[in-house]
């Protein structure tokens, strides 16, 4: 008979476990952005980009917060962060400035607390896009795992936006915590 | 639709500078090459240069280096063509022009005749 | 830069006869696996216009007895029926190179 009890109780406690690594997970933060198309700045010079969607089509976004174009951390944590950019043209759409281009996306950290800004990752390449080309395309992925504090924001800064290709599957960055901080 | 409204007809002496404009509309002037292109009467049509209007960026024929200069006014999607020292050779019409959607210069302005004459 | 000379200088046709006006480059004008020759009618007094774009394709609106040939460096265009109203010079372009260049021109006359 105790034993079974104790069987009984042990599923219960299981369960309870299973229950609270559930809701920790949970409460995981995560975000993943797509790049708002009704937005893009034009021209070739560097910008930050500042419309992203947060919950539409495949942009969702828990325990963090989307404000003023920043993705802004609410836990501390070691954190991987990704960021997905393409570049494309097609003659249909006018022509190139210039047939030389660099194509670059820098993802950056800026501390509030400690007013800071730090270049976290940066990827591209510089291109010739022959305008005789019907059709030009380019895409940069970045990703890597970063220690982030509360109030911590991330952005995204690009060259050329008015090449930026406006899919929700094309032009995106996101992060999700992987472990606290010791 | 893609318009190309060219300034009137002018009358310079030798020497002298004249100023032409383009004023573009129907399409975002930023996107595409503005090009201008000669013709002395009775003759064929020469290929001048061409100006991209977002950041002002030129090309032109090797002929024309000295002779024309190329700008834009992004706030009034126009173009201009300085021509300066001129002679009786820069006498023709002068064409602002654009390509069309593929190629090909598909959209004409009606032309600019300058004379020079003493 | 690149020569486009024009064939012949004029040309008389008689109208329902077909009209052949060659146009051949210093130089292929071919890149990206097209060709950067385009073909143009003007009438006296006005501006040019487009025909025939990347050698062989209609421009939107004109008549199909308008056609373009060729590749590299010899190109042809072709009225298949001449009409009164093709009376114009016809002209030859290219944009594979800067500086873009014409040809000399064809004047095409109607008996």
């Known amino acids: 008979g105790s034993q079974h009890i104790r069987a009984e109780k042990a599923m219960v406690d299981g369960s309870w476990l299973d229950l609270a690594k559930r809701s920790k997970l949970e409460a995981q933060p995560f975000a993943h952005l797509t790049i708002n198309a009704t937005d893009i700045p034009s021209g070739s010079h560097k910008v930050s980009l500042s419309s992203w969607y947060h919950d539409r089509g495949w942009a969702k976004i828990s325990n963090m917060t989307f404000s003023n174009g920043k993705l802004i951390v609410n836990q501390d944590g070691f954190y991987y962060l990704y960021a997905n950019i393409c570049f494309r043209h097609h003659e249909t759409s006018g022509d190139l400035a210039t047939e030389y281009l660099q194509l670059m996306v820098y993802v950056t950290k800026t501390s509030i607390k400690i007013p800071s800004s730090h270049t976290l990752m940066k990827g591209g390449s510089t291109k010739y896009w022959s305008g005789n080309s019907e059709f030009h395309f380019y895409s940069i992925n970045v990703g890597g795992f970063f220690k982030l504090r509360s109030g911590e924001e991330i952005s995204i800064e690009v060259s050329n936006p008015s090449l930026l290709d406006p899919d929700q599957d094309a032009t995106y960055f996101g992060a999700f915590k992987v472990r606290d901080i010791d | 639709q893609v318009q190309l409204q060219q300034s009137g007809a002018e009358l310079a002496s030798p020497g002298a500078s004249v100023k032409l404009s383009c004023k573009a509309s129907?399409?975002?002037?930023?996107?595409?090459?503005l090009q201008w292109v000669k013709q002395r009467p009775g003759q064929g049509l020469e290929w001048i240069g061409a100006?991209?209007?977002?950041?002002?960026?030129?090309k032109y024929t090797q002929k024309f280096k000295d002779k024309a200069t190329l700008t834009a006014d992004k706030s009034a999607s126009t173009a201009y063509m300085q021509l300066n020292s001129l002679t009786s050779e820069d006498s023709a019409v002068y064409y602002c022009?654009?390509?069309?959607?593929?190629?090909?210069?598909?959209?004409w302005g009606q032309g600019t005749l300058v004379t020079v004459s003493a | 830069n690149i020569v486009l000379t024009q064939s012949p200088a004029s040309l008389s046709v008689s109208l329902g006869q077909r009209a052949t006006i060659s146009c051949r480059a210093s130089?292929?004008?071919?890149?990206?696996?097209?060709?950067?020759m385009h073909w143009y009618q003007q009438k006296p007094g006005q501006a040019p216009k487009l025909l025939i774009y990347l050698a062989s394709n209609l421009e939107s609106g004109v008549p199909s007895r308008f056609s373009g040939s060729g590749s590299r460096t010899d190109f042809t265009l072709t009225i298949s029926r001449v009409e009164a109203e093709d009376a114009a010079t016809y002209y030859c372009q290219q944009d594979n190179e800067d500086p873009y260049t014409f040809g000399g021109g064809t004047k095409l006359e109607i008996k």
């Open positions: 022009a654009r390509r069309g959607s593929r190629r090909g210069i598909a959209y």
């Open positions: 130089e292929s004008v071919d890149s990206y696996g097209r060709s950067f």
């Open positions: 100006i991209y209007p977002g950041p002002g960026n030129t």
């Open positions: 129907g399409y975002t002037f930023t996107t595409y090459w």
